[in-house]
């Protein structure tokens, strides 16, 4: 026969019970918590140190970009993509059109210090969009030339240059003096590139990838 | 990792936390209702308040649940 | 709504319902604790037993409130 | 040595156009470069008025756009000014010169220059 | 366009002294700036191109420097021959213009 437990001991054992529950409780809830904070705070830090990081980027670029036009890539509300205010954007790049009048050093000088190159064309869509925003009686010069006069033309960024995507004039490159290239117009043939001396001032075309923030 | 994966990552810990308590209690519920029947078998119905009790308490929360 | 704010809303929800339910499942546990334990008493005391739990249950309820 | 020369009259009456000639020698205007005209009013201030390139063609500064035409003679290896409805404003000492020396850093070869006097 | 202010506009020096004269471009030229003498009834000559780079012929006793939107031309133990008008000119974007003038007279 199982000795009968005395009611004190009995209400002593509910008590560390009841305790232990509440114990369990109290620990499940302050896990709970932890993870609803981490998920609260953690994305609100993450957003602030991408806010810091976005900031500091976008002071990389004030000097010479004082506005961004940014528009959200996909349906992440993280990325944006941008390109200075006057700039034009196509696919991942931004262009400008330079209606100075500069030789092609300083002309890609004066792209350099804006962050960017003289433009580098690398399909015909690309030329097909940038030419709906050049006047036909301008020349602008390109990220294309060649330095030595050996015909081995090279773009600034060190794409490799691919005769198959070319757009010359016809009977163009024609004279090994001429070390540079411009996109103009001709009636005859509509937009395409010529060789010409690169000291002689053009207008200039700019191109630099979209700033991601 | 990137904020919204974190966050789908929670969701996922407090789903399954969810799951696994409604299933806890649930069995516990069982077991409470099925102890409440033998003891009124045995008892002459000494449990039936606590079982009425505890069936309010879970109709409650039917109401009450938030709709997933 | 976009797809994270939607998902920070989840995450309330999961949350609530996940306190909720662990309160009620200790609550389930210590009732059927002292169900158990006020079985062993003599019949005409049963409800005592019942009615005093029922008052500790509802105190516990209200210090182990989490704050909002 | 490339040689520059320039030519026209040194009258020009208010209203009518003055036109300069820039005879080059020792290098063809066809060959590169751009062709320039510049000119220096009697306090001294200089002025780029605006080039013709070895291709043909031409920039011009914008205070003179719509007055101002530069041409050339491939054959004779000369290029021309032309600027119309001329003031007493005009007075100056028109020089040519090639421009695109040194990476486009500075006007290497100059004309001697002509004195032109706008008056009545 | 940018605009060339030159100072200063007149100097008076003595054969032997260093001289020299400044010229600041209203925005960044990045070097591209040149230096010309000239002497009355005469056509300007180059001296300097690119900020520091001296033409060939041109006496070392010259010397260009700066950077961004200030530039000097600096003249060591002047000589006779050094008399004259001297003019700065950027040639960073077309028009290219040139500064005042700095006439430097014999002391």
């Known amino acids: 026969m199982v000795p009968e437990e005395e009611p004190q001991d009995r209400e002593k054992g509910l008590w560390w019970f009841q305790l232990k529950v509440w114990s369990m409780a109290v620990v499940s809830i302050l896990l709970l918590s932890v993870c609803f904070t981490v998920s609260s705070v953690v994305p609100h830090n993450f957003m602030y140190s991408k806010t810091v990081k976005r900031l500091s980027k976008l002071r990389e670029y004030q000097q010479y970009h004082p506005s961004l036009t940014c528009v959200m890539e996909g349906k992440d509300i993280e990325d944006w993509s941008c390109c200075p205010t006057p700039w034009t954007s196509f696919q991942s790049s931004c262009y400008f059109i330079s209606t100075g009048m500069q030789s092609w050093t300083k002309s890609q000088k004066n792209c350099s210090v804006m962050g960017a190159d003289l433009v580098v064309i690398n399909t015909r869509e690309e030329q097909d969009f940038i030419i709906q925003n050049l006047k036909r009686n301008s020349s602008y010069f390109l990220g294309l030339s060649d330095p030595g006069g050996r015909r081995h033309w090279q773009w600034v960024d060190q794409t490799p240059y691919n005769e198959n995507v070319t757009f010359w004039h016809s009977g163009e490159p024609n004279n090994l003096d001429e070390r540079c290239a411009i996109i103009n117009f001709r009636s005859s043939e509509e937009w395409g590139w010529n060789d010409i001396h690169c000291h002689v001032p053009q207008k200039s075309i700019c191109k630099m990838k979209k700033i991601y923030i | 990792l990137g904020e919204p994966q974190l966050c789908y990552i929670l969701d996922a810990i407090l789903f399954l936390y969810g799951i696994v308590l409604t299933l806890l209690y649930c069995r516990l519920k069982i077991q409470v209702r099925k102890a409440a029947i033998t003891s009124y078998e045995k008892s002459d119905g000494v449990y039936t308040g606590l079982s009425t009790r505890n069936q309010e308490t879970y109709e409650t929360l039917k109401h009450e649940k938030p709709p997933q | 709504l976009g797809e994270p704010q939607l998902c920070y809303i989840l995450d309330a929800i999961l949350f609530l319902y996940g306190i909720v339910l662990t309160l009620l499942y200790c609550r389930l546990k210590i009732q059927v604790r002292k169900a158990a334990i006020t079985s062993y008493e003599k019949s005409d005391g049963v409800y005592t037993g019942l009615s005093t739990r029922n008052q500790e249950t509802y105190e516990t309820l209200k210090h182990e409130k989490p704050p909002q | 040595d490339v040689q520059l020369q320039e030519s026209g009259p040194g009258l020009v009456k208010p209203s009518q156009s003055l036109s300069l000639t820039c005879s080059v020698t020792g290098y063809s205007i066809t060959s590169g470069y751009y062709w320039n005209w510049i000119r220096q009013f009697p306090g001294n201030k200089l002025e780029c008025m605006g080039y013709?390139?070895?291709?043909?063609?031409?920039n011009y500064n914008p205070s003179l756009k719509d007055r101002i035409s530069i041409t050339r003679d491939t054959s004779k290896n000369q290029f021309f000014l032309k600027l119309n409805s001329v003031t007493t404003e005009d007075t100056a000492t028109y020089y040519c010169?090639?421009?695109?020396?040194?990476?486009?850093?500075?006007?290497?070869?100059w004309g001697h220059g002509t004195l032109v006097t706008v008056s009545a | 366009d940018i605009q060339m202010t030159q100072s200063p506009v007149s100097l008076s020096a003595s054969v032997g002294e260093t001289v020299t004269i400044t010229c600041r471009a209203s925005?960044?030229?990045?070097?591209?700036l040149a230096w010309y003498q000239q002497k009355q009834g005469k056509s300007p000559q180059l001296l300097v191109y690119?900020?520091?780079s001296l033409v060939d012929g041109v006496p070392s006793r010259f010397s260009g420097s700066g950077s961004g939107t200030q530039y000097s031309l600096k003249i060591n133990s002047l000589q006779p021959e050094d008399f004259g008008s001297y003019y700065c000119?950027?040639?960073?974007?077309?028009?290219?213009?040139f500064g005042g003038g700095t006439k430097l007279e014999i002391k």
């Open positions: 000119q950027h040639f960073w974007i077309i028009p290219y213009t």
């Open positions: 010169a090639r421009g695109g020396d040194y990476d486009d850093g500075g006007f290497a070869y």
């Open positions: 690119n900020a520091k």
């Open positions: 925005g960044n030229i990045h070097n591209y």
């Open positions: 013709i390139t070895y291709d043909g063609s031409n």
